[in-house]
C-alpha cells in the first residue's frame, strides 16, 4: 500500500481549525491479523528526504499522537493530553487518517508528516509516510477560511475547506 496526501498545501488564517489528511491507497488488508500504527509529526523539507526529522507538534511527540487499531477498526485519540493541546488524530474505515489542529497560530506553520506502519502478523511489516505543508497567515492577506491545494499537479484548482 501507499500513502497519498490529497492536499500538499493548506493555507489558513490564524485562529482557524484545520484537518490535515493522509489516505492509504492500494490493497489495505482489513483482516483481524493486521494492525496499523499511525502517527503525525512535524519535520523539515530536507534536500534528499522529507520527513526524516521528527519534531513534536505543539510539544506532543509522534509517540503521544499515535493510534493503533486492527484492519477492521476505526480509531481516534481521545486522551486528554492531545485535546489539551488542541489536537486530535483520527482514522476511519476507508483509509483516511487525519489530525485536527484547533485555534491555529503562526507557530503552527511548517511541514507535517503522517507515518503508517502496517503489521501483518506472522508475515511482514511495512511503513510509509506522506508530507504536506501548513501555512498560517495573519493580517489582511490571510484567507477568511482555510484554502487547500491538491497534491496533483494537473489539478491546479483551489478547494476551500468546509
Amino acid at each position: 500500500f501507499k500513502v497519498a496526501t490529497p492536499y500538499s498545501l493548506y493555507v489558513c488564517p490564524e485562529g482557524q481549525n484545520v484537518t490535515l489528511t493522509c489516505r492509504l491507497l492500494g490493497p489495505v488488508d482489513k483482516g483481524h491479523d493486521v494492525t496499523f500504527y499511525k502517527t503525525w509529526y512535524r519535520s523539515s523539507r530536507g534536500e534528499v528526504q522529507t520527513c526524516s526529522e521528527r519534531r513534536p507538534i505543539r510539544n506532543l511527540t509522534f509517540q503521544d499522537l499515535h493510534l493503533h487499531h486492527g484492519g477492521h477498526q476505526a480509531a481516534n485519540t481521545s486522551h486528554d493530553l492531545a485535546q489539551r493541546h488542541g489536537l486530535e488524530s483520527a482514522s476511519d474505515h476507508h483509509g483516511n487518517f487525519s489530525i485536527t489542529m484547533r485555534n491555529l497560530t503562526l507557530l503552527d506553520s511548517g511541514l507535517y508528516c503522517c507515518l503508517v506502519v502496517e503489521i501483518r502478523h506472522h508475515h511482514s511489516e511495512h511503513r510509509v509516510h506522506g508530507a504536506m505543508e501548513l501555512q498560517v497567515q495573519t493580517g489582511k492577506d490571510a484567507p477568511s477560511n482555510c484554502v487547500v491545494y491538491p497534491s496533483s499537479s494537473q489539478d491546479s484548482e483551489n478547494i476551500t475547506a468546509a
Epitope: 528526504q49 526524516s52 509522534f62 509517540q63 493503533h68 511503513r127
Partner: antibody
C-alpha cells in the same frame, strides 16, 4: 530505565532445542508500541535477526529460521523466550534480546547478550 | 527479504580522519535505515535512525545520509573511542542487517 537480561544454558547438544529467556525490567512487555525480539551473532561475524513478538502474542520470524523458531511471551512474568529446535554447530552465537519501537523502527534497547555453544 | 550490502568490511584510519561507510539496500527502503556501533564484548548501540537522525546523547561527529537504496555513515573526526564495528539495518520491512564494518586506528 528499561533493562533486558538474557538467561539460559551456555551449552546445548546438537539436534536439541536451544531455550533462552529475556527478563524485562523498568517497563512493561504489554506496552502496545513495541516488538520484543531476538538477534544473534556468531563469533566474529555479523548480526542476524531471528524474530520478534508483538505484545498481543503475534510473531514475525526470519524466513530462514522460521521452521525452527518459536518466541513465546509471558506477560505475567514480564518476559519472553526463544526456542530454536534441531540446533547444529552453526547456531553457536551470542544471543541478544532487544526491544524495537514500532514507530521509530530500530532496536533501541538491548540485553548484554549470552553466548550459546552447540557441541556434543 | 531485503538484502543490505555494507562496505568496506574493515578499514584503518588515523585519529582525526574522516571515515565513511556505505550501505546499499537491494530495494528502495525510503529512509528507514539505522546505524549501530558495537564495541568488543558489548551489545550494539543505536547511533542513527531514519538514515540521518542522531540518537540522543550521540556525539555530533557521527552523521548519516542517503535515501532509497544508497546510504552513507560518516565519522567526521575519528577518535580512539570510535574503534568498533558499525552495522546498518533496514526497517522498511522485516529487519535485516548489513555485514558490518570494523573500524581500527592506524
Amino acid at each position: 530505565q528499561l533493562q533486558l537480561q538474557e538467561s539460559g544454558p551456555g551449552l546445548v547438544k546438537p539436534s536439541e532445542t536451544l531455550s533462552l529467556t529475556c527478563i524485562v525490567s523498568g517497563g512493561s512487555i504489554s506496552s502496545s508500541g513495541y516488538y520484543w525480539g531476538w538477534i544473534r551473532q556468531p563469533p566474529g561475524k555479523g548480526l542476524e535477526w531471528i524474530g520478534s513478538i508483538f505484545y498481543s502474542g503475534n510473531t514475525h520470524y526470519n524466513p530462514s529460521l522460521k521452521s525452527r523458531v518459536t518466541i513465546p511471551v509471558d506477560t505475567s512474568k514480564n518476559q519472553f523466550s526463544l526456542k530454536l529446535s534441531s540446533v547444529t554447530a552453526a547456531d553457536s552465537a551470542v544471543y541478544y534480546c532487544a526491544r524495537r519501537d514500532i514507530l521509530t523502527g530500530p532496536f533501541d534497547y538491548w540485553g548484554q547478550g549470552t553466548l550459546v555453544t552447540v557441541s556434543s | 527479504d531485503i538484502q543490505m550490502t555494507q562496505s568496506p568490511s574493515s578499514l584503518s584510519a588515523s585519529v582525526g580522519d574522516r571515515v565513511t561507510i556505505t550501505c546499499q539496500a537491494s530495494q528502495d527502503i525510503t529512509n528507514y535505515l539505522t546505524w549501530y556501533q558495537q564495541k568488543p564484548g558489548n551489545a550494539p548501540k543505536l547511533l542513527i535512525y531514519d538514515a540521518s537522525n542522531l540518537e540522543t546523547g550521540v556525539p555530533s561527529r557521527f552523521s548519516g545520509s542517503g535515501s532509497g537504496t544508497d546510504f552513507t555513515f560518516t565519522i567526521n573526526s575519528l577518535q580512539p573511542e570510535d574503534v568498533a564495528t558499525y552495522f546498518c539495518q533496514q526497517y522498511h520491512n522485516l529487519p535485516t542487517f548489513g555485514g558490518g564494518t570494523k573500524v581500527e586506528i592506524k
